[in-house]
Interface confidence: low
C-alpha cells in the first residue's frame, strides 16, 4: 500500500501565505487591516525608524529560539564525577586563607580518565553542597588562571536557608580548557562578592567539605558530598561514529536552500506584503523571508531486519520517537514591523515569524 | 469532503513504544540490547546510585527545554524607548563621581506612560552605546535600590574594540518593579568589577552620553544615542482580551491529563522497560512517563466570513501559520539511566525523552 502523494508546492505556499495573513492580524488583535486614511505622507519619522532599527538590532544580536542541537546532543552522554582533591593536600597551603574565599582543587589526570578528549565533553558542572545560611549572600566563582591569578566565571545570589542544598555552576568551558592543557592540578575559588565601594565582605555560606573556620580541614560530613565535578561526555568508542559520519544535518537555510533534499527541510518563501497579501498598511519592512517546513519524516519500524542501519536513521527522521513524526519549525525568529493607527506610528514585534530551521518531531 | 479519521489509540501507543525502543538503542549507538551475562548480582553500587541521583537532581532543577510560552507571548509587543534623563538633571549631583562607576537615571513617569501596568511588560533592555575600549574590561550593572544603596544585577566581560557597539542588558524584572512602585526617578550604575583582593579598578569603557571625565555632561555625539530603555509591552487595549478570555491553554500534563480535550494535547504513556519492551538491562529507572502528542490542529482559512472569530483560533490551532499544522512536543525533558556494559555500570543521560507539553506547529 503506497501512501505517496505528489505535493502541490503552490497550494502549500498559498496556504502558508493565507495563514500568515491571519497570523499577523491575530497577533495584533485586529479583525481587519487598519484604515490608512489619516497616515501622513512622506517617509517615517526619524525617531520611529531609530526605534524600528533598535528592535531589528536586538533580533540580529540574539535569536529568539535556542540554536538547533548539534548531532552529538542527540546521543546519550556518559555521566561521571570527579571529587575535589582532599583539603590536606599541600596545594591548599599555597593559597592564603581569607575570610572572603574558599578554594577547591581538582586532579586533571582524573578528569582526563573520565573524558579523554576535550571535544567529547558535553557539560561539566561544579556541584557544592551548601549547608545552612543565615543571611542572603552574593558569591562569585573564579577559575585558577596562572600562578596566582584568578579569572572571574560567574556569580550567584544565595537566599537564606536552614536546610542543605546543592549548588551547581556550569563550568564546561573551563574543564574543556583544563583537558586541553598540561597542568596537573587546577582549581576554583568561591568568594564573597565585593563591590568597589564595600570591600569588607565575608563569605558567610558554609560549603560541605570545609570547616566553618575555613582552615581547609575536611568536615566530618560524608566525604562523598564534598565539592565535585559532574561530567557528561560522549564515550570515546561512540565518538568515532560522530566524526566519521555526520548523519544528522541541521535542516536550516544554509543546508536546505542549497540542496535538493526531498525529506523534511526548510523551504524558501519571501512574502511581499503588497504583492502577496495586498497590504499597504505595513510601512516597514516591505516584506520578509517567512519560509516554511516541508518534506516527509518517515516512521521507522525498529523491528526491521536491517536493524543497525535503521537505528542510524532515528537521529534524522524521528529523534523524538513519535508515532507519526512531522516536519515542523525548530528555530524561529521574530519580526519587527512599523504600521500606523490613525496618525500614530507604532513599532511592534511579532514573535516566531521567520522559520530558520526545521526538524522531524 | 470530510477527512475525519477515527484514531486507533492502541496502534498509536504501540507505534510510540516501538519508536522508543529504537530511540534508546540509537541514542546509545547499540545495535541490540547489551548482554547481561557478566552483570554482578545484588543492588547497584552506592557510588553509582549517588551519581544517578546527582543526574536526576540536575534534571529536576532545570528543565532541558524552555517553558512553553504564555499566551501573552503569542501577541505582538509594542516597542517604545525611554531615554536616560539628561545628565544636567540635579539627580546626578546626589551621587558622588568616582573613577569606577557611571550613573544612569530614568523618569518613571515616562516608563508608566509607555507601559501603564507592570504585568503588560514583556521585556525591558538597557541599551548603552559603548565607544572605543583599549583593554578588556569586566563591568557590573547595579540597580538603585533604596536611598543610597545599590543591588547587583549582572555583569559582562567586554572585549577590546575600536568601533562603537551597542550593549544590551536584560532589566525586565527591575523595570517591572519600578512600574509597581511609587518612585519618580530610578537608576542604574555601571561599575568596574572589583574583587575582594584588587580594589583599584577604573571603569575604562566609554559609554556614549558621558564625557570621558565622567563629569556627567552629555557628550556631543547625537543625544538619541545616549543610554535608553527599550521596552516591549502588550498595549493596554490588547491586554483586556488576555484577562477576559484565556483562549490559549498550555497543552501540558496539568491540563491535558485532566481534560477530555479532543484537539492537540499531551497524552499519558508510561513505559515499563520490562513489560512494554521486554528489557531487563536498564537497572534504573524501572520505567518512565514518556507520554506523546496527539490530536488535530485544524488549518484555518483566514478568508473565512466569521473573520474576528477565526482570528481568535490562530493562537491555539496554528500559531506558527503553518500550511499543515501538526501536534508535536513542545517541552521535553531528559532521562538518566543506569545499565551495565559487561561488569561495568554506566550512568547515561538521554536527551529529550519525556514529553511534558505539546503544541500545534
Amino acid at each position: 500500500l503506497s501512501t505517496c502523494k505528489t505535493i502541490d508546492m503552490e497550494l502549500v505556499k498559498r496556504k502558508r501565505i493565507e495563514a500568515i495573513r491571519g497570523q499577523i492580524l491575530s497577533k495584533l488583535r485586529l479583525a481587519s487591516p487598519p484604515s490608512q486614511g489619516e497616515v501622513p505622507p512622506g517617509p517615517l519619522p526619524e525617531a520611529v525608524l531609530a526605534l524600528y532599527n533598535s528592535t531589528r538590532d536586538r533580533v540580529a544580536g540574539e535569536s529568539a529560539e535556542p540554536e538547533p542541537e548539534p548531532e552529538a546532543d542527540y546521543y546519550a552522554k556518559e555521566v561521571t564525577r570527579v571529587l575535589m582533591v582532599e583539603t590536606h593536600n599541600e596545594i591548599y597551603d599555597k593559597f592564603k586563607q581569607s575570610t572572603h574565599s574558599i578554594y577547591m582543587f581538582f586532579n586533571t589526570s582524573e578528569l582526563r580518565e573520565a573524558v579523554p578528549e576535550p571535544v567529547l565533553l558535553s557539560r561539566a558542572e561544579l556541584r557544592l553542597l551548601r549547608l545552612k545560611l543565615k543571611v542572603e549572600q552574593h558569591v562569585e566563582l573564579y577559575q585558577k588562571y596562572s600562578n596566582n591569578s584568578w579569572r572571574y566565571l560567574s556569580n550567584r545570589l544565595l537566599a537564606p536557608s536552614d536546610s542543605p542544598e546543592w549548588l551547581s555552576f556550569d563550568v564546561t568551558g573551563v574543564v574543556r580548557q583544563w583537558l586541553s592543557r598540561g597542568g596537573e592540578i587546577e582549581g576554583f575559588r568561591l568568594s564573597a562578592h565585593c563591590s568597589c565601594d564595600s570591600r569588607d565582605n565575608t563569605l558567610q555560606v558554609d560549603i560541605n567539605g570545609f570547616t566553618t573556620g575555613r582552615r581547609g580541614d575536611l568536615a566530618t560530613i560524608h566525604g562523598m558530598n564534598r565539592p565535585f565535578l559532574l561530567l557528561m561526555a560522549t564515550p570515546l568508542e561512540r565518538a568515532q561514529h560522530l566524526q566519521s559520519s555526520r548523519h544528522r544535518r541541521a535542516l536550516d537555510t544554509n543546508y536546505c536552500f542549497s540542496s535538493t533534499e526531498k525529506n523534511c527541510c526548510v523551504r524558501q518563501l519571501y512574502i511581499d506584503f503588497r504583492k502577496d497579501l495586498g497590504w499597504k498598511w505595513i510601512h516597514e519592512p516591505k516584506g520578509y523571508h517567512a519560509n516554511f517546513c516541508l518534506g516527509p519524516c518517515p516512521y521507522i519500524w525498529s523491528l526491521d531486519t536491517q536493524y543497525s542501519k535503521v537505528l542510524a536513521l532515528y537521529n534524522q527522521h524521528n529523534p523524538g520517537a513519535s508515532a507519526a513524526p512531522c516536519c515542523v519549525p525548530q528555530a524561529l525568529e521574530p519580526l519587527p514591523i512599523v504600521y500606523y493607527v490613525g496618525r500614530k506610528p507604532k513599532v511592534e514585534q511579532l514573535s516566531n515569524m521567520i522559520v530558520r530551521s526545521c526538524k522531524c518531531s | 469532503l470530510s477527512t475525519c479519521k477515527t484514531i486507533d489509540m492502541e496502534l498509536v501507543k504501540r507505534k510510540r513504544i516501538e519508536a522508543i525502543r529504537g530511540q534508546i538503542l540509537s541514542k546509545l549507538r547499540l545495535a541490540s540490547p547489551p548482554s547481561q551475562g557478566e552483570v554482578p548480582p545484588g543492588p547497584l553500587p552506592e557510588a553509582v546510585l549517588a551519581l544517578y541521583n546527582s543526574t536526576r537532581d540536575r534534571v529536576a532543577g532545570e528543565s532541558a527545554e524552555p517553558e512553553p510560552e504564555p499566551e501573552a507571548d503569542y501577541y505582538a509587543k509594542e516597542v517604545t524607548r525611554v531615554l536616560m534623563v539628561e545628565t544636567h538633571n540635579e539627580i546626578y549631583d546626589k551621587f558622588k563621581q568616582s573613577t569606577h562607576s557611571i550613573y544612569m537615571f530614568f523618569n518613571t513617569s515616562e516608563l508608566r506612560e509607555a507601559v501603564p501596568e507592570p504585568v503588560l511588560l514583556s521585556r525591558a533592555e538597557l541599551r548603552l552605546l559603548r565607544l572605543k575600549l583599549k583593554v578588556e574590561q569586566h563591568v557590573e550593572l547595579y540597580q538603585k535600590y533604596s536611598n543610597n544603596s545599590w543591588r547587583y544585577l549582572s555583569n559582562r566581560l567586554l572585549a577590546p574594540s575600536d568601533s562603537p557597539e551597542w550593549l544590551s542588558f536584560d532589566v525586565t524584572g527591575v523595570v517591572r518593579q519600578w512600574l509597581s512602585r511609587g518612585g519618580e526617578i530610578e537608576g542604574f550604575r555601571l561599575s568596574a568589577h572589583c574583587s575582594c583582593d584588587s580594589r583599584d579598578n577604573t571603569l575604562q569603557v566609554d559609554i556614549n552620553g558621558f564625557t570621558t571625565g565622567r563629569r556627567g555632561d552629555l557628550a556631543t555625539i547625537h543625544g538619541m544615542n545616549r543610554p535608553f530603555l527599550l521596552l516591549m509591552a502588550t498595549p493596554l487595549e490588547r491586554a483586556q482580551h488576555l484577562q477576559s478570555s484565556r483562549h490559549r491553554r498550555a497543552l501540558d500534563t496539568n491540563y491535558c491529563f485532566s481534560s477530555t480535550e479532543k484537539n492537540c494535547c499531551v497524552r499519558q504513556l508510561y513505559i515499563d522497560f520490562r513489560k512494554d519492551l521486554g528489557w531487563k538491562w536498564i537497572h534504573e529507572p524501572k520505567g518512565y512517563h514518556a507520554n506523546f502528542c496527539l490530536g488535530p490542529c485544524p488549518y484555518i482559512w483566514s478568508l473565512d466570513t466569521q473573520y474576528s472569530k477565526v482570528l481568535a483560533l490562530y493562537n491555539q490551532h496554528n500559531p506558527g501559520a503553518s500550511a499543515a499544522p501538526c501536534c508535536v512536543p513542545q517541552a521535553l525533558e531528559p532521562l538518566p539511566i543506569v545499565y551495565y556494559v559487561g561488569r561495568k555500570p554506566k550512568v547515561e543521560q538521554l536527551s529529550n525523552m519525556i514529553v511534558r507539553s505539546c503544541k500545534c506547529s
Epitope: A47, V48 | V82, E113
Partner: antibody
Framework: QVQLVESGGGVVQPGRSLRLSCAAS????????MNWIRQPPGKGLEWIGY???????YRANWARGRFTISRDNSKNTLYLQMNSLRAEDTAVYYC????????????????WGQGTLVTVSS | DIQMTQSPSSLSASVGDRVTITCQAS??????LAWYQQKPGQPPKLLIY???TLEYGVPSRFSGSGSGTDFTLTISSLQPEDFATYYC??????????FGQGTKVEIK
C-alpha cells in the same frame, strides 16, 4: 475629518469651579493623547497639561493644584476640571490632539478645537 | 523649567519678503521643537515639528532649522495669507510643554 469641539465655558465668579468638555470625532480617540492649552485675551499660548491613552496625566507646574484632566474613552470626550478660579484664569481654552512619536514626549498639537471662552469675574 | 525666548516679538514685512523668526531654548532640547501659526479668532495650526519636518499640507515656503538651543523658522517668500502670529514650542520633557511668547508678522 478630525473634529474637536470644546464646551462648558462662560462667565464664572472667582473661587468657583467649572468643568470644560471636548468632544472628539473623526479619529480613534482612545489611542491618542490629548492636551489642554489656554490663551488669555491678547496674550500667548499656555500649555495646561495632557492625558495619555491610559489616563496618566501631566500638568504644567502652575496647574497642578487646581486643574484636573480626565477622559471618557467610551464617550470620546476629554474633560478639564478647574477649581478655585481666579481672574487671571480668564482665557480661551483649547483642547488639542497630541501626536506621540516614540522616544521622548513628542507632544506636537496637530489638531485643535475652536476653543471656549472662560471669563472669571465678579 | 526650560524657557523659550522668541525674537523678534513683532516684525513688519512685505509680500515676497524672506522672513526669519528665531527661538532660543534655555537648555538643549535636541530637535524637539514645533512651530505654529495663529490667525486672529482661530486656533493655532501646526507648521513644523521635529525642528525641520514640514507638516502635511503646509506650503514648502515654510522651513525650519536648528538643534540644541537655537532654532529658526523661515518663510522664503511671504504671502498675504502668512500675516499672523507664530509660536515655537518645545516638547523635550515629559513634564512640560513650553510655548514661546509669539512673533507677530504684520504688513509693512
Amino acid at each position: 475629518q478630525v473634529q474637536l469641539v470644546e464646551s462648558g465655558g462662560g462667565v464664572v465668579q472667582p473661587g468657583r469651579s467649572l468643568r470644560l468638555s471636548c468632544a472628539a470625532s473623526g479619529f480613534h480617540f482612545s489611542s491618542e493623547a490629548m492636551n489642554w492649552i489656554r490663551q488669555p485675551p491678547g496674550k500667548g499660548l499656555e500649555w495646561i497639561g495632557y492625558i495619555y491613552t491610559s489616563g496618566t496625566t501631566y500638568r504644567a507646574n502652575w496647574a497642578r493644584g487646581r486643574f484636573t484632566i480626565s477622559r471618557d474613552n467610551s464617550k470620546n470626550t476629554l474633560y478639564l476640571q478647574m477649581n478655585s478660579l481666579r481672574a487671571e484664569d480668564t482665557a480661551v481654552y483649547y483642547c488639542a490632539r497630541g501626536w506621540h512619536i516614540f522616544d521622548h514626549h513628542y507632544w506636537v498639537m496637530h489638531a485643535w478645537g475652536q476653543g471656549t471662552l472662560v471669563t472669571v469675574s465678579s | 523649567d526650560i524657557q523659550m525666548t522668541q525674537s523678534p516679538s513683532s516684525l513688519s514685512a512685505s509680500v515676497g519678503d524672506r522672513v526669519t523668526i528665531t527661538c532660543q531654548a534655555s537648555q538643549s532640547i535636541s530637535t524637539y521643537l514645533a512651530w505654529y501659526q495663529q490667525k486672529p479668532g482661530q486656533p493655532p495650526k501646526l507648521l513644523i515639528y521635529a525642528a525641520s519636518t514640514l507638516e502635511y499640507g503646509v506650503p514648502s515656503r515654510f522651513s525650519g532649522s536648528g538643534s540644541g538651543t537655537d532654532f529658526t523658522l523661515t518663510i522664503s517668500s511671504l504671502q498675504p495669507e502668512d500675516f499672523a502670529t507664530y509660536y515655537c514650542q518645545s516638547y523635550s520633557d515629559g513634564d512640560s510643554v513650553i510655548f514661546g511668547q509669539g512673533t507677530k508678522v504684520e504688513i509693512k
